[in-house]
């Protein structure tokens, strides 16, 4: 079953290559187990950036080597992606799945265009 997911259209990464955005979903029921996946669409390909499954009311847990961190509050997930460089500019899509209890619901946001600008190297000081 389909579910509506909202996310901002555009986000600019900061000078340290970190970008944050909120992914909000319209839950049709009382889900206790939710899976959030961040996908990146670029060059006619979709790749998975990171994913986390969490129990409602608990923290999101990404893998140790993940470039993503996040927190949840109700039907909102605050996502942060770190270590971005200019070549990582692209459309980042939030996919939310209500895993338990049944029925299964899935929603996909319209994507957040994340722009990353590599910082200029500091000039050598004499």
């Amino acid at each position: 079953k389909a579910m509506h997911v909202a996310q901002p259209a555009v986000v600019l990464a900061n000078s340290r290559g970190t970008a944050s955005f909120v992914c909000e979903y319209a839950s049709p029921g009382k889900a206790t187990e939710v899976r959030v996946t961040v996908l990146r669409q670029a060059d006619s390909q979709v790749t998975e950036v990171c994913a986390a499954t969490y129990m409602m009311g608990n923290e999101l847990t990404f893998l140790d080597d993940s470039i993503c961190t996040g927190t949840s509050s109700g039907n909102q997930v605050n996502l942060t992606i770190q270590g971005l460089r200019a070549m990582d500019t692209g459309l980042y899509i939030c996919k939310v799945e209500l895993m338990y209890p049944p029925p299964y619901y899935m929603g996909i946001g319209n994507g957040t265009q994340i722009y990353v600008i590599d910082p200029e190297p500091c000039p050598d000081s004499d």
């Epitope: 669409q41 006619s44 459309l91 899509i93 994507g111």
Partner: nanobody, 126 residues
Framework: QVQLVESGGGLVQPGGSLRLSCEAS????????IGWFRQAPGKEREEVSC????????NYADSVKGRFTVSRDNSRNSVILQMNSLKPEDTGVYYC???????????????????WGQGTQVTVSS
Amino acid sequence: QVQLVESGGGLVQPGGSLRLSCEASGGTLDYWSIGWFRQAPGKEREEVSCISGTGLRTNYADSVKGRFTVSRDNSRNSVILQMNSLKPEDTGVYYCTGKLLHPSLWSACANEYDLWGQGTQVTVSS
């Protein structure tokens, strides 16, 4: 650059079955809208089936409804067209087509396609 490759065609008797596969080389078909077209000798190319990027929506031409089934096999990075109760009028070259739409359209079939495979011949004859 992604390329589409069809396989599974051949000669089959009326009432028989074939399983066509559309695979991607040089990339993945994740979240791509995939269509199946066929062209019979002396006839125009027609779309027989499509499946949305999420796999939640499928469409079929009236002539194949109830006989053909399209599905995604993400583990093998392919889209399958299962053709049952084949008729002589199903004879033709079958083409796999694909397009990666904006995420807002991942639940829909594409209106037009960017990528075409080389086709696989299906002949239904006794």
